[in-house]
């Protein structure tokens, strides 16, 4: 039979920030090679990373056709010696199915990770600092441009901003659901600021890990009277 | 189903200490922020603070910091408010609740404190 | 500190009335601003979020306007059960503050 010695792929696990997303497995081949394929629930198998050796497939170009579709992968053993036939072969010399594993379903606008942010910039004027995040781009596309997480997410995404002064401990917060902040400060006073993203209507995955810390007297920050 | 029950409230005398607790239940508080509000004898509602559980970060209202911390601990899904030098107008019902960002989405039931000699 | 300034602080009402309540921030707070409604011995339970969004399960009797600095409740039609104390709170930055409260009765 084409699908001797065949070991199943186990632990299937979606690896996704930003909508760049991978699907990883086990085990590391031995006389065989993996072909993956992913769907969504109503639509056709789409066949990705054919015959490969790694235990991981970059599904990102897949997914990011609706982030909001859920998507069903799995991954087919194939034998070593099937592999060398070219594509057709997938289904074993004699046509009968290879050994594949289910990974579990995933929803890319649902559970996607939120990227650590990035502080872009801080400007002073007087007591009042407006602080940017940068909105990072993602690999969704529309109408042939990237859109950034800002623009899949709309008010959907909430940035959290701690601030305090350098010469305190004590934490301040704010929040915005675009991407800049405009907060009192007192005047004579270096403050730092670090930023969390958060998807409030989420259940899992709802934030981000916190940018690094930028403080005002370092380059990313502008001073006016 | 979502549930937060605090405990640890009683009768306390001034310039003591008391740890209230708020055990979570149907989530895990390291994905949300979580506050303590509270609430004196036919008074209004006060906000003390929040923590992020999964970073440690806390913020204070000023007038609170340094005599309250909060804490939490993941293992437990449980959020705790540690109160020192408790004044007679520390007597309240303290609340803890759960923020999704956009509001205080569950309330404990609230457990009573009264500072009196 | 953003100061909330709610008003009025207690209210008289018939069923069926036109009810509304008013919160003024001492400066812009973008919306982060809920309506609590709070009963004798229980937590407040939210009924308003960003200003105007119903919050889910409530009915739609209930509802939030407002921007900037100035934000308004209202209960289109007071029913018995809409006895209670009202609060506004802005979370847009810390602290975080309540109005003083609005106390609802029936006359």
């Known amino acids: 039979s084409g699908t001797t010695n065949t070991v199943a792929a186990y632990n299937l696990t979606w690896k996704s920030t930003n909508f760049k997303t991978i699907l990883e497995w086990e085990p590391k081949p031995v006389n065989q090679v993996y072909t993956v394929q992913i769907s969504t629930k109503s639509g056709d198998w789409k066949s990705k990373c054919f015959y490969t050796t790694d235990t991981e497939c970059d599904l990102t170009d897949e997914i990011v056709k609706d982030v909001k579709q859920t998507y069903l992968a799995r991954v087919f053993s194939v034998p070593w010696r099937n592999s060398t036939h070219g594509k057709e072969t997938l289904f074993g010399t004699h046509g009968e199915e290879p050994p594949y594993e289910n990974s579990p379903e995933f929803t890319p606008y649902l559970e996607t990770n939120l990227g650590q942010p990035t502080i872009q910039s801080f400007e002073q004027v007087g007591t009042k600092v407006n602080v940017t995040v940068e909105d990072e781009r993602t690999l969704v596309r529309r109408n042939n441009t990237f859109l950034s997480l800002r623009d899949v997410f709309g008010k959907d995404l909430i940035y959290t901003l701690y601030y305090w002064k350098s010469s305190s401990s004590g934490k301040k917060t704010a929040k915005t659901n675009t991407n800049e902040f405009l907060i009192d400060v007192d005047k004579g006073e270096n403050y730092c600021f670090s930023v969390q993203a958060v998807i409030p209507s989420r259940t899992v995955n709802r934030k981000s890990t916190d940018s690094p810390v930028e403080c005002m007297g370092q380059e990313k920050g502008e001073f006016r009277e | 189903q979502v549930q937060l029950v605090e405990s640890g409230g009683g009768v306390v005398q001034p310039g003591r200490s008391l740890r209230l607790s708020c055990k979570a239940s149907g989530f895990n508080i390291k994905d949300y922020y979580m506050h303590w509000v509270r609430q004196a004898p036919g008074k209004g509602l006060e906000w003390i603070g929040l923590?992020?559980?999964?970073?440690?970060?806390?913020i204070y209202d000023p007038k609170f910091q340094g005599r309250f911390t909060i804490s939490a601990d993941n293992s437990k899904n449980t959020l705790f408010l540690q109160m020192d030098s408790l004044r007679p107008e520390d007597t309240a019902v303290y609340y803890c609740?759960?923020?999704?960002?956009?509001?205080?989405?569950?309330w404990g039931q609230g457990t009573p404190v009264t500072v009196s000699s | 500190d953003i100061q909330m300034t709610q008003s009025p602080s207690s209210l008289s009402a018939s069923v069926g009335d036109r009810v509304t309540i008013t919160c003024k921030a001492s400066q812009d707070i973008r919306k982060y601003l809920n309506w609590y409604q709070q009963k004798p011995g229980k937590a407040p339970k939210l009924l308003i979020y960003?200003?105007?969004s119903l919050a889910d399960g409530v009915p739609s009797r209930f509802s939030g306007s407002g921007s900037g600095t100035d934000y308004t409740f209202t209960i289109s039609s007071l029913q018995p059960e809409d006895i209670a104390t009202y609060y506004c709170l802005q979370h847009g930055e810390s602290p975080y503050t309540f109005g003083q409260g609005t106390k609802l009765e029936i006359t």
């Open positions: 960003y200003a105007t």
């Open positions: 923590i992020d559980p999964e970073n440690g970060n806390t």
């Open positions: 609740a759960r923020d999704n960002s956009y509001y205080f989405d569950y």
